[in-house]
Interface confidence: low
């Protein structure tokens, strides 16, 4: 049996749950810390194209799998036309960014807005112009763009022609799309994210059917999709590393999402094993090949040998180290609905600090960007979102403790989200924006919520002052 404790993979994270003080890096007595974040801490905010852009077939945009899924699977949702209409109201988004005073804006490019059928030929001019204008405006404001290439809106044509991410043909097609984006936008983009939360793409897209394309119950498909997502990411990283990094001098990663979990019985070793299994089966599934030893976690290989694809030795070498930092998502999409298989009969927890400690121990203390964090409110809540403030304070406090007390190398934080918008399987029943948008209004004004004022103050003070 291969024991990899020295290199920091596969199992070290179990120490998080141990109540033996020699084992656990998190001191639970440190409840709140009045302190500042590191001097050049990177404060930002994010959106996903499908969630906020609207205009799903305007100006030559092709349909995505989510546009199709909305029409076929989600009841009482006509289309994302009812969203915040960022495609039309770009200036209003920029004013919202100005109001908060962020250092960066994380947004995603809609693949079918650039290439309506997914194949890289001549780009849709209006789509190209939209993203180019946005980037120019950000640069002008000294706001760093962090650009996600794929936030779930696969061109429908690729799903229908190839079966989407189930088909490894898509790896090269995705790489072509990435190459185009690097060529057109790389002069203004220093931070790239290939794929947003591939776990949810695979698990809910092909396992539960709760996400597009809505396929259900085929475990082999779930892990094939995961496999192709990892290989696509790796290919794009090598592409960027070889052909674009030398002159564009940027960084590239993949956003990996996870829940956190606590043992039913804190002194029970087997419950702790189950918690480890839970984290490994969600976060480790993608993190181990990319941030670890280049392969799936040992436990997954053993338990899922009949459905989990195999990486060849050459592929392991190729996968390993294909991220310039650890981009981590911690938000409601990984908690509700939680994969009960991943829950392992244990208790889910919103302890971001412990999740960060787990990453530190498992993956050799990487530099971490919190690439998505926040909670949600009911759609009836307008601008007085006190729950969101409470959650944000809690999460930010945990990040600060992780940095100051646990020496975890978090360099940036992405509040989620800039705007109220389309929230996937929850459609418009919840809100996650720091700015309120009345979806039924014509002008879609962005009204700062209490959380926007709160986040603005945090950024201004670079943390929590007494």
């Amino acid at each position: 049996i291969l024991l990899r404790a020295v290199t920091g993979f596969s199992g070290d994270g179990r120490a998080i749950w141990s109540k033996n003080p020699n084992f656990t890096p998190v001191n639970e007595s440190q409840l709140f810390l009045y302190d500042t974040f590191p001097k050049n801490f990177f404060w930002g905010i994010g959106t996903g194209a499908l969630q906020v852009e609207g205009s799903w077939k305007k100006d030559g945009k092709g349909p995505s799998i989510w546009d199709h899924f909305i029409h076929t699977h989600l009841k009482n949702v006509s289309s994302t036309n009812g969203s915040s209409d960022s495609y039309i109201f770009l200036e209003k988004d920029l004013s919202a960014l100005d109001f908060i005073g962020v250092s960066f804006y994380q947004f995603s490019i809609s693949w079918p807005r650039l290439f309506p059928d997914g194949i890289v030929t001549v780009a849709n001019a209006k789509g190209l112009q939209y993203y180019s204008t946005l980037l120019d405006a950000l640069v002008l404001r000294n706001i760093e763009p962090i650009v996600t290439l794929y936030h779930w809106d696969l061109p429908l044509a690729l799903q229908e022609k190839y079966g989407g991410w189930k088909n490894d043909t898509i790896i090269d097609i995705f790489n072509d799309y990435a190459t185009y984006c690097f060529q057109m936008f790389g002069d203004r983009v220093k931070y790239w994210i290939t794929i947003h939360n591939p776990y949810l793409v695979a698990w809910h897209g092909y396992g539960t059917g709760m996400h597009a394309p809505g396929e259900k119950g085929n475990l082999a498909a779930v892990y094939t999709v995961g496999h192709n997502l990892i290989k696509a990411h790796s290919k794009v990283w090598h592409n960027y590393n070889t052909h674009f990094r030398p002159h564009q001098k940027g960084w590239l990663s993949i956003t990996l999402g996870s829940h956190w979990i606590e043992p039913n019985r804190s002194e029970n070793t087997m419950d702790i094993f189950k918690c480890q299994q839970s984290m490994v089966s969600v976060l480790g599934w993608f993190a181990n090949p990319i941030h670890g030893d280049g392969d799936y976690p040992e436990g997954m290989r053993k338990k899922l040998f009949s459905v989990l694809p195999i990486f060849s030795e050459a592929e392991k070498h190729e996968m390993r180290g294909t991220a310039d930092f650890f981009a981590f998502s911690f938000g409601p999409n990984n908690f509700k609905p939680l994969n009960t298989m991943a829950k392992m009969g244990q208790n889910v927890s919103l302890n971001l600090r412990e999740a960060l400690n787990w990453i530190k121990l498992e993956y050799n203390n990487p530099r971490i960007l919190i690439a998505e964090n926040g909670w949600f409110t009911d759609s009836r809540v307008k601008t007085e979102d006190t729950t969101a403030i409470y959650m944000m304070k809690n999460f930010l406090s945990q990040v600060l403790q992780a940095i100051r007390l646990d020496e975890i190398r978090v360099f940036g934080y992405t509040a989620w989200s800039l705007l109220d918008g389309f929230e996937w399987q929850d459609a418009y029943t919840i809100r996650r924006g720091l700015f309120y948008v009345d979806f039924n209004s014509k002008q879609k004004e962005r009204k700062p919520k209490s959380s926007a004022h709160y986040y603005k103050q945090i950024i201004r003070e670079n943390g929590f002052s007494l």
């Epitope: 049996i1 024991l3 404790a5 596969s10 199992g11 070290d12 994270g13 179990r14 120490a15 141990s18 033996n20 084992f23 002194e267 029970n268 070793t269 087997m270 419950d271 702790i272 094993f273 189950k274 918690c275 480890q276 299994q277 490994v280 976690p297 040992e298 436990g299 997954m300 290989r301 053993k302 338990k303």
Partner: antibody, heavy 124, light 108 residues
């Protein structure tokens, strides 16, 4: 090479306390993926698990014998000790210690290396 | 607590396939380990985690586990395979190791 060796008295009297020592080599009792179990086997009968100790010092005992058993480890000596009180002739058996392995950080993967066993007879 | 049930004995001719079962409530959701014990010797792990073989164990030994039954299969049985075989699980609810009652394999 991983080895475990049991040692202790060959003969104990009824009501006495049995102390068995398992000395390990080739691995550390501090290794987060290792644990040690004690198992016994009365003559001509099946294996019966007695107790287990994990690297973080967590212990687990057979329900039927819990009140009579204590397991502990001395990492510096690479030893695991089992104490069994109030011995009875029905406790006559071969006592084994075995290494338990956890792979992938969370799977209990059985007992991959066993000692050769020590035979204990309880008789007055 | 969790109970594992094994047949007391199984007989098979040399060269044939022996199948030793281990029954338990929803055992398919547990990891099952199998041990071989020859007379006067300590047990030896022959299959772990349902179907994995430790190094040095011949490929003739294989395992499967689903529903309420786990099975140890020994193909092309040899005289040297004659031994007692025990199945074992870790019962996560009680945090206990549980052994089956053992099966005596006789090679005819």
């Amino acid at each position: 090479q991983v080895t475990l060796k049991e040692s202790g008295p060959v003969l104990v009297k009824p009501t006495e306390t049995l102390t068995l020592t398992c000395t390990v080599s080739g691995f550390s009792l501090n290794n987060a993926r290792m644990g040690v179990s004690w198992i016994r086997q009365p003559p001509g009968k099946a294996l019966e698990w007695l107790a287990h100790i994990f690297s973080n010092d967590e212990k687990s005992y057979s329900t039927s014998l819990k009140s009579r058993l204590t397991i502990s480890k001395d990492t510096s000596k690479s030893q695991v000790v089992l104490i069994m009180t109030n011995m009875d002739p029905v406790d006559t058996a071969t006592y084994y210690c075995a290494r338990s392995v956890v792979t992938g950080g969370y799977y209990y993967d059985g007992m991959d290396v066993w000692g050769q066993g020590t035979t204990v007879t309880v008789s007055s | 607590s969790y109970v594992l049930t094994q047949p007391p004995s199984v007989s098979v001719a040399p060269g044939q396939t022996a199948r030793i079962t281990c029954g338990g409530n929803n055992i398919g959701s547990e990891s099952v380990h199998w041990y071989q014990q020859k007379p006067g010797q300590a047990p030896v792990l022959v299959v772990y985690d349902d179907s994995d073989r430790p190094s040095g164990i011949p490929e003739r030994f294989s395992g499967s586990n689903s529903g309420n039954t786990a099975t140890l299969t020994i193909s092309r049985v040899e005289a040297g395979d004659e031994a007692d075989y025990y199945c074992q699980v870790w019962d996560g609810n009680s945090d206990h190791v549980v052994f089956g009652g053992g099966t005596k394999l006789t090679v005819l």
